[in-house]
């Protein structure tokens, strides 16, 4: 099908024209411009950048560009009372203190307003006590400690290494274990790739580098004081005691030089196995407390950060659709950074800027997309996806009726090995078809398609000859659109080789060393990977906004639903006796999946044959495609997580970053063998199967012939 038919325009204004207009050199210039000073949410610098982007998007040719502001709860260190951790002796004297700041990178020594490393939303406090090393502080790590090793974390300060799961889950787990403080650190095993030098000589984390980040457990709520509603001028705000997702114990992050000093003295139990050892030259003893000579020494935290209601600013740009202006395709990424944001977020923001420029160029030449494209520069993503969530709360009625798709645009790179895509199954075919048309930027794949290099380097575990596409989890601005509103969503970026680099994220993530130079010297000197990501993100937006029939394939949803049903059934079948005792059956779910598969197949046949020149029928078919994702939304939400409403996907309860399929059933089954009331627990499993089966069946019926 040709996108040109959409708005009856000249053939030169097609996808190729849009892609050809994207330039690596522009992305490079934009990245440089966005990374010279810090743009922390709630600061004047970030407000000024919002106004600059507003002005430039207008110049690029968008129809309108507005600032949308909200007053949300943010968190900052106390400028005169710094946060740190000490080792104290028996007299209470501080004999060792962790560093108060990261040594600035070369060329940035005189930059002001670099926020020191802190855990955003940590409460104030000065707890002191014995240390317990809890590995990654995952659910399974606390199971190992409490159940197998009989180590009690109650009243202890725990030290956990970053990686594997979202830091907020670590803190939640520590709280549930009774800890009175949490120290987070970056172990070189996870943040130092072998054979690579530390910054500024390479892309590895130096010993003084520290990962900042929020430690909330919002579960999709947005601003902690106004869950469900926008934090506008007349908002009713909860008291801090009723705020959503705030941690109850002090938390602070440190680098591995400081961690070495704490961990080298650890006594108590030896680590349970090698998976608990990092790369520092320390025993990785679990504790509690320090070894022999140092047993009278304790650890003390000094946390003085404050939570403050602060104004934030989204930039919302509109390119009105010529044929279906009431159908919205959204491209959004955040603008706020912890410090310079060399990768997160500005490598993404620079790509969005260039995509806007390219669309604007086409518009100035007389072209318009078929559907409206909205461009967003979100604020306060780092503080809990606040800007995007507040805007979506404010515009939820419009979005649920008009939202076709949301494409996320945070960091364009987390490596330079191959493409990484997470998206709704509805977009699988769109992504496959698009990447087949794009050139691979990879060495050794000259003249080959992006699809080919991607498939070779990151093959699908299920389907040979196809690339891996992952489930959407959370930890980024698509969350509200996908998990709460049920708008088809996707994200794409260039990533590392997960086989050879098992560190978590990229080493300099959320540190002061995430600079323009990091990208320009070590990750993407030619900006060819950035350009490829711009082509993927921009190409997806172009097709979603311009194709006559929406580029969604509902048959791909049928395939994954069967896979997810098989998976959850096999998890349940680990308890055959209980399934028999409590009459647990998955028949309804498998039946619903079978129905969905058949109806989706028939819908796809009709989609090939219908009269596309009939605008009413075209709109009807497109609406069925648009509303399919919406049909997976349960208005009541998941148990204890009312803003996670998607029945097929939710962020894992144990790791916000990861997506879980049939999350309601999964959570009901999780650790079911330890539940005190098995009858009640298995009753909840049955209820969740019922909800899932009903939802799949109901979604299938939205694809049936309307009359």
């Amino acid at each position: 099908k040709s996108s040109n038919e959409a708005t009856n325009i000249t053939p030169k204004h097609n996808m190729k024209a849009f892609l050809d207009e994207l330039k690596a050199e522009n992305i490079k210039k934009f990245l440089y411009n966005f990374t010279q000073i810090p743009h922390l949410a709630g600061t004047e610098q970030n407000f000024q950048l919002a106004k600059q982007i507003q002005s430039q998007w207008k110049e690029f040719g968008l129809d309108s560009v507005e600032l949308a502001h909200y007053d949300v709860l943010l968190s900052y260190p106390n400028k005169t009372h710094p946060n740190y951790i000490s080792i104290i002796n028996e007299d209470g004297n501080e004999i060792f203190n962790t560093s108060l700041f990261e040594p600035p990178p070369p060329g940035y020594e005189n930059v002001s307003d670099i926020v020191p490393p802190f855990s955003a939303f940590s409460p104030q406090g000065m707890p002191e006590g014995d240390l317990v090393y809890v590995n990654y502080a995952r659910t399974e790590d606390f199971f190992k400690l409490e159940r197998d090793m009989k180590i009690n974390c109650s009243g202890k300060i725990v030290i956990a290494r970053y990686g594997k799961v979202f830091r907020g889950n670590k803190v939640k787990n520590a709280q549930l274990a009774g800890a009175k403080g949490v120290i987070l650190y970056s172990d070189p095993a996870d943040y130092f790739a072998p054979g690579v030098k530390s910054y500024p000589d390479g892309w590895n984390l130096p010993g003084g580098g520290v990962q900042r980040g929020n430690i909330l457990n919002l579960n999709g709520a947005g601003d902690p004081l106004t869950p469900g509603y926008p934090a506008n001028e007349y908002a009713y705000r909860r008291g801090i005691a009723e705020a959503v997702g705030l941690p109850s114990i002090p938390v602070h992050p440190i680098g591995y030089y400081d961690a070495q000093k704490l961990l080298e003295k650890m006594g108590g139990s030896a680590p349970p196995d090698s998976s608990w050892r990092g790369s520092l030259k320390v025993p990785y003893n679990v504790g509690p407390g320090f070894t022999g000579n140092f047993s009278t020494q304790k650890v003390k935290m000094h946390i003085h950060s404050t939570n403050e209601v602060t104004r934030i600013y989204n930039v919302i740009g509109t390119l009105r659709g010529a044929v279906e202006p009431d159908r919205y395709v959204i491209l959004g990424g955040h603008r706020d950074s912890w410090v310079f944001g060399g990768i997160d977020p500005q490598s993404g923001a620079a790509v969005v800027h260039e995509i806007v420029r390219s669309f604007g160029t086409l518009k100035k030449e007389g072209w318009r997309p078929r559907r409206t494209i909205l461009f967003a520069s979100w604020d306060a993503e780092e503080f809990g996806l606040l800007g995007s969530t507040e805007w979506a709360e404010e515009n939820s009625r419009l979005l649920q009726e008009r939202g076709v798709a949301y494409i996320n645009a945070d960091s364009s790179i987390e490596g330079n090995y191959t493409l990484r895509v997470d998206c709704t199954p509805l977009m699988y075919s769109l992504v496959h078809n698009l990447t087949k048309e794009l050139k691979s930027p990879d060495e050794g794949f000259e003249g080959k398609s992006l699809y080919e290099s991607w498939t070779k380097k990151s093959p699908s575990p299920e389907f040979s000859g196809m690339p891996r596409i992952s489930k959407l989890g959370s930890g980024n601005d698509f969350e509200v659109f996908f998990q709460r509103l049920g708008i088809a969503s996707g994200r794409a970026r260039y990533t590392k080789n997960w086989e050879t680099n098992k560190f978590s994220g990229y080493p300099l993530y959320h540190s002061v060393y995430e600079t323009y130079e990091l990208v320009e010297k070590f990750y993407d000197p030619m900006f060819k990977y950035h350009l490829t990501v711009a082509q993927v993100r921009g190409g997806m937006v172009f097709e979603l906004a311009n194709s006559i029939v929406l580029p969604f394939d509902c048959r791909d949803y049928a395939v994954v639903l069967r896979k997810y049903a098989d998976k959850i059934y096999s998890i349940s079948m680990k308890h055959p006796q209980e399934m028999k005792t409590y009459s647990v059956s998955f028949d309804s779910l498998f039946s619903a999946v079978k129905n969905f598969t058949e109806i989706a197949s028939k819908f796809s046949e009709r989609l090939q044959d219908f009269d596309k020149s009939n605008p009413i029928v075209l709109r009807m078919m497109n609406d069925q495609l648009m509303f399919l994702e919406r049909a997976f939304i349960d208005p009541l939400g998941l148990p204890d997580r009312p803003f996670y409403r998607h029945v097929i996907y939710a962020p894992s309860s144990h790791n916000k970053y990861a997506g879980e399929s049939f999350p309601g059933i999964y959570d009901a089954l999780f650790d079911i063998e330890s539940k005190v009331d098995p009858s009640k627990a298995w009753g909840e499993v049955k209820r969740q199967i019922y909800v899932a089966a009903f939802t799949v069946q109901a979604a299938a019926e939205t694809l049936s012939e309307v009359a």
Partner: antibody, heavy 120, light 112 residues
Framework: QVQLVQSGAEVKKPGASVKLSCKAS????????INWVRQTPEQGLEWMGG????????NYNENFKGRVTMTRDTSSSTAYMELSRLRSDDTAVYYC?????????????WGQGTTVTVSS | DVVMTQSPLSLPVTLGEPASISCRSS???????????LHWYQQKPGQSPRLLIY???NRFSGVPDRFSGSGSGTDFTLKISRVEAEDVGVYFC?????????FGQGTKLEIK
């Protein structure tokens, strides 16, 4: 760049004490342990011990315990090593060396050495 | 204490030819985290020792690639692929896995 500058040569009588200094620059002093290594033609290189400038924690070689004391002054980024009850076989070149911490855990930077002569 | 034994103690080499020094420890140098903290130092006449290779096989910054290290457990080797005049000096192996840290007796490399 990292530099360790040691104090000048010393001549001491048996039974006396000697206190050597090692001034560090070009890096964050409290992050890296300072070790002391001596070199004699007879014994070769001998590790005497180390000090953690951050907390002052020391780790001595048993062969020198009771005779060696390592201290530091964080305000001047200087480490000190005092050796008491000197004997003629303590005549040696004494080096301070910075432990490179992760990923090295080796002595990545050495001072120029201080010659100590013990003679009656 | 861990005893480090080097051989040979003296190594005359022709310029441009390879050289190899062996180092054996009295016990395993594998630390509990799986790393082996065996290092090689070079000491040129009248100078302080200088780190050459750390953790068995990793060249320290600025060290030419003609130097390489290998080995595991208790047996280790330093190789120079093509000896140059500036390589003259004494080479020490050392371990920092166990306290106290210990050094080999040194191998004196000289030009034939």
């Amino acid at each position: 760049q990292v530099q360790l500058v040691q104090s000048g040569a010393e001549v001491k009588k048996p039974g006396a004490s000697v206190k050597l200094s090692c001034k560090a620059s070009g890096y964050t002093f409290t992050y890296f342990d300072i070790n002391w290594v001596r070199q004699t033609p007879e014994q070769g290189l001998e590790w005497m011990g180390g000090i953690s400038p951050g907390d002052g924690n020391t780790n001595y070689n048993e062969n020198f315990k009771g005779r060696v004391t390592m201290t530091r002054d964080t305000s001047s980024s200087t480490a000190y090593m005092e050796l008491s009850r000197l004997r003629s076989d303590d005549t040696a070149v004494y080096y301070c060396a910075r432990d490179g911490n992760f990923p090295y855990y080796a002595l990545t930077n050495w001072g120029q050495g201080t010659t100590v002569t013990v003679s009656s | 204490d861990v005893v480090m034994t080097q051989s040979p103690l003296s190594l005359p080499v022709t310029l441009g030819e390879p050289a190899s020094i062996s180092c054996r420890s009295s016990q395993s140098l594998v630390y509990s985290n799986g790393n082996t903290y065996l290092h090689w130092y070079q000491q040129k006449p009248g100078q302080s020792p200088r780190l050459l290779i750390y953790k068995v096989s990793n060249r320290f910054s600025g060290v030419p690639d003609r130097f390489s290290g290998s080995g595991s457990g208790t047996d280790f080797t330093l190789k120079i692929s093509r000896v140059e005049a500036e390589d003259v000096g004494v080479y020490f192996c050392s371990q920092s896995t166990h306290v106290p840290y210990t050094f080999g007796q040194g191998t004196k490399l000289e030009i034939k």
